[in-house]
């Protein structure tokens, strides 16, 4: 997956730091105080749709076969720049019963982006 | 995840059968001859972005906090109707060395859709 560098407008991963205080979650998340969540942005022209090597690759490659041949309804279906690889991060937080929990939370950090 | 029923234009799962013969893959995929791959289509208005209960839910909920508050650049970032739950299917196929392989292939079938 591409890293956004300001020079490309193709689907890429943009660095982004989330502050839990900013979004009002610091009342239940003890640590960390924030993290690099990152996000995906950019264009997905038809020639790169479904070519991300993502977890959706078999499915998106299949759909792209139809899209590239102008098969209705896929010709009009927009391909999206989305997370294709996410990673886990450890957090210390209060659960519903106010117990302190330390847990690896899946799908917190966007590692790679690709076109759906 | 919603099933498309022709009445809603909100992000939903559309039934779709893929014929491997149609896409020219029947030379290497022995069986099955096709499968219900399905796909996602529909609108993702801001009030349902990141509310899909998807595998991206922590990340997309975080991003949505910023989006809903009009935080640049998320206010302009389009939320996409994407697969949020995929399932595995068994396939019988020729590998690169023309051995016949029977294997469960992940992420072949879209089971649920949601907004990124």
């Amino acid at each position: 997956g591409l890293e956004c560098d300001g020079k490309v407008n193709i689907c890429c991963k943009k660095q982004f730091f989330v502050s839990f205080k900013d979004i009002g979650w610091n009342d239940w998340i003890i640590a960390p105080s924030g993290y690099h969540a990152n996000y995906c942005e950019g264009e997905c022209p038809s020639h790169i749709a479904g070519t991300s090597g993502s977890s959706l690759s078999f499915h998106s490659t299949v759909i792209n076969h139809y899209r590239m041949r102008g098969h209705s309804p896929f010709a009009n279906l927009k391909s999206c720049c989305i997370p294709t690889k996410l990673s886990t991060m450890s957090m210390l937080y209060f659960d519903d019963e106010y117990n302190i929990v330390k847990r690896d939370v899946p799908n917190m950090i966007v590692e790679e982006c690709g076109c759906s | 995840g919603l099933e498309c029923d022709g009445k809603v234009n909100i992000c939903c799962k559309k039934q779709f059968f893929v014929s491997f013969k149609d896409i020219g893959w029947n030379d290497w995929i022995i069986a099955p001859s096709g499968y219900h791959a399905n796909y996602c289509e529909g609108e993702c208005p801001s009030h349902i972005a990141g509310t899909s209960g998807s595998s991206l839910s922590f990340h997309s909920t975080v991003i949505n906090h910023y989006r809903m508050r009009g935080h640049s650049p998320f206010a302009n970032l389009k939320s996409c109707c994407i697969p949020t739950k995929l399932s595995t299917m068994s396939m019988l196929y020729f590998d690169d060395e023309y051995n016949i392989v029977k294997r469960d292939v992940p992420n072949m079938i879209v089971e649920e859709c949601g907004c990124s």
Partner: antibody
Framework: EVQLVQSGAEVKKPGESLKISCQGS????????IGWVRQMPGKGLEWMGI????????RYSPSFQGQVTISADKSISTAYLQWSSLKASDTAMYYC?????????WGQGTLVTVSS | SYELTQPPSVSVSPGQTASITCSGE??????ACWYQQKPGQSPVLVIY???KRPSGIPERFSGSISGNTATLTISGTQAMDEADYYC????????FGGGTKLTVL
């Protein structure tokens, strides 16, 4: 609702020709293979052959090659099984079946009786 | 040519487990499917891709593969399960087994 509706029972004399039909509805007829299966009185199932209505690609069991002809007319979602010269040993129930992940839908069967 | 061998008949008491075998070669290169056929009716797919059950088929039906044998198992057999059962080997073409008559005593 997926349905395969076969033509009615036939009584023929040896040497006569015959064409029986199988009409599909409730699904994309051109995207699934249709198989034909013979069941002689009091006996088991025998696979005769299969056709892909999308392009009329046909495969026969070695036992039935040259004995019958399988065809399809996609404009009316119908597959056919025909004989140019019937024999008494062709007396049987003939089923058409849609090939999905196996023969997932079957016609009601056409009983063919060949007797002098 | 490829052949599948099934026992002609299997008997089971109600509530017991019935096992129907299907012997053939190279199951690693083929899928096993199983069909149930009741008198005067069309066959019904009960197991596909070796072990999977179509929607609407009761959980008591299961399939397995071990070595050269595919097996259909019916646990807690009911009177309504009395029927002929056919295995099918599916790759580029198709072969059916000779069929097994299941009798529920």
């Amino acid at each position: 609702e997926v349905q395969l509706v076969q033509s009615g029972a036939e009584v023929k004399k040896p040497g006569e020709s015959l064409k029986i039909s199988c009409q599909g509805s409730g699904y994309s007829f051109t995207s699934y293979w249709i198989g034909w299966v013979r069941q002689m009185p009091g006996k088991g199932l025998e696979w005769m052959g299969i056709i892909y209505p999308g392009d009329s690609d046909t495969r026969y069991s070695p036992s039935f090659q040259g004995q019958v002809t399988i065809s399809a007319d996609k404009s009316i979602s119908t597959a056919y099984l025909q004989w140019s010269s019937l024999k008494a040993s062709d007396t049987a129930m003939y089923y058409c079946a849609r090939q999905g992940l196996g023969f997932d839908y079957w016609g009601q069967g056409t009983l063919v009786t060949v007797s002098s | 040519s490829y052949e599948l061998t099934q026992p002609p008949s299997v008997s089971v008491s109600p509530g017991q487990t019935a096992s129907i075998t299907c012997s053939g070669e190279k199951w690693g290169e083929k899928y096993a499917c199983w069909y149930q056929q009741k008198p005067g009716q069309s066959p019904v797919l009960v197991i596909y891709q070796d072990t999977k059950r179509p929607s609407g088929i009761p959980e008591r039906f299961s399939g397995s593969i071990s070595g050269n044998t595919a097996t259909l198992t019916i646990s807690g057999t009911q009177a309504m399960d009395e029927a002929d059962y056919y295995c099918q080997a599916w790759d580029r073409s198709t072969v059916f087994g000779g069929g097994t008559k299941l009798t529920v005593l």
